[in-house]
Interface confidence: medium
């Protein structure tokens, strides 16, 4: 059923290549609605009737919500931001985060995707991520591929670069994590690695690109030399326990 | 190191076609994106088309969508660009870029030239 | 075309910082922490010199430094040298559909 779905939760924005270099392979974020079960490190947490979560930043709030200051006027004043629930479309927005999963902030308003450009929305992805042994029903992202996934990309568990529906498809030390528009095996991070933070149920909806979850023995950090002046720019990176 | 050749680049005339290759070494080219970045004389620089490691999916500017197609060969580390029905404002220096989340790497580019 | 926009020129003397803007909307730039800034000397390629905002490559000078606030992104160049001496492109995406999107560029120009 919809909601015993599993989902990889652990968001990147652009994993260090593993050659060394700037920049590097990315794919963009599966979140999952209150009630689904997601993938927190190798436990799996339920996330029904939570309480309003404080935050710093949209990333650490649910693909329904986005971090913002309870009462009306600047974000943060008066103390503690909290996630809040997503606009609906049509509604008044300042950022994509503050829209609702298949829409996006233009102009000041809350717009539907153009899914004819756009990859699937955060519920059809976890439809897609529950279709079991059908991996030609789920080669689509919203865009038509010019070849179809086969079962037989499943026989051996994906290296690094394959196209992957769960982090199951990937060899040891990968995590499945979007790119662009498809879903690829990536390196699970190492002490050190630039990471993403996502204290609960992974990343808002208009994440593009993914990182995988830090490696054991590791937690995604603030990187306590690093002050940025924006919060949506500190850096957090893998670091020991 | 990492390093990207671009070849294939001439003049050519409206309406005619040109293949463009890029020659990738020093990392694992069938784990990358990559993509295609133009620049024409004196201007700024357009992304063009990207391709998926796998080949399973490629996409492009609206600018060339139809007339253009990206392929790799993952096997000789190669990386394509099918040029068709080529128009004067399609006069640019073509460039291969490792595409991450940014275009980490690129080559050295290849002039394309559409004269009559 | 959609493109970020940039001054078309900036200039600044040996030492000096100087900072490049980058303005984009809502649905690209303003969007996104997926800003890159690129240097292009004339007649060579494009080098990566800032990812993910305020990211630096390795090998690239502590004197490049990015920041972003709200529908702008920024380069500053501190202590400014002859070599600096380049155009500049931003990048990020648009939302619908996804693609990657540049600045015009701005030239830099280091004076004396």
């Known amino acids: 059923t919809l909601n015993s779905v599993l989902i990889n939760s652990n968001a990147i924005k652009n994993l260090p290549p593993p050659l060394g270099g700037a920049g590097g392979q990315p794919g963009s974020a599966v979140s999952v609605a209150p009630g689904v079960l997601y993938e927190g490190g190798n436990k799996y947490q339920t996330l029904d009737n939570y309480q309003p979560y404080p935050c710093a930043e949209d990333e650490e709030c649910g693909s329904d919500e986005y971090c913002s200051s309870p009462s009306r006027g600047a974000a943060g004043v008066g103390g503690v931001q909290i996630c809040l629930a997503c606009r609906k479309r049509r509604k008044r927005c300042m950022r994509h985060a503050m829209c609702c999963p298949g829409n996006y902030c233009k102009n000041g308003i809350c717009m539907p995707s153009d899914h004819s450009h756009f990859p699937r929305g955060e519920i059809e992805e976890s439809i897609i991520e529950n279709l079991g042994n059908d991996h030609n029903a789920a080669a689509g992202d919203g865009y038509p591929r010019r070849t179809t996934l086969t079962s037989k990309i499943y026989h051996t568990k994906g290296q690094e670069g394959s196209v992957c529906l769960r982090s199951s498809d990937c060899a040891a030390g990968l995590c499945c994590a979007r790119h662009f528009w498809s879903k690829i095996c990536k390196p699970v991070l190492k002490e050190g690695q630039v990471c993403t933070k996502h204290k609960r149920k992974g990343s808002h909806g208009l994440e593009i690109f993914q990182r995988c979850y830090c490696g054991e023995g590791l937690a995604c950090r603030i990187q306590k030399d690093h002050h940025q002046a924006s919060n949506s720019s500190r850096l957090h990176t893998c670091q020991r326990h | 190191q990492v390093q990207l050749v671009e070849s294939g680049g001439g003049l050519v005339q409206p309406g005619g076609s040109l293949r463009l290759s890029c020659a990738a070494s020093?990392?694992?080219?069938?784990?990358?994106?990559m993509s295609w970045v133009r620049q024409a004389p004196g201007k700024g620089l357009e992304w063009v088309s990207v391709?998926?490691?796998?080949?399973?999916?490629?996409y492009y500017a609206d600018s060339v969508k139809g007339r253009f197609t990206i392929s790799r060969d993952n096997s000789k580390n190669t990386l394509y660009l099918q040029m068709n029905s080529l128009r004067a404002e399609d006069t640019a220096v073509y460039y291969c870029?490792?595409?991450?989340?940014?275009?980490?790497?690129w080559g050295q580019g290849t002039l394309v030239t559409v004269s009559s | 075309d959609i493109a970020l926009t940039q001054p078309a020129s900036v200039s600044g003397s040996p030492g000096q910082s100087i900072t490049i803007s980058c303005t984009g909307t809502s649905s690209d730039l303003g969007g996104y922490n997926y800003v890159s800034w690129y240097q292009q000397h004339p007649g060579k390629a494009p080098k990566l010199m800032i990812y993910d905002v305020n990211n630096r490559p390795s090998g690239v000078s502590n004197r490049f430094s990015g920041s972003k606030s709200g529908n702008t992104a920024s380069l500053t160049i501190s202590g400014l040298q002859a070599e600096d001496e380049a155009d500049y492109y931003c990048?990020?995406?648009?939302?619908?559909?996804?693609?990657?999107?540049f600045g015009g560029g701005t030239k830099l120009t280091v004076l004396g």
């Open positions: 020093g990392f694992t080219f069938s784990s990358y994106w």
């Open positions: 391709i998926s490691s796998d080949s399973s999916s490629t």
């Open positions: 870029a490792r595409h991450g989340i940014d275009f980490d790497h």
């Open positions: 990048q990020s995406y648009t939302y619908t559909p996804i693609s990657p999107v």
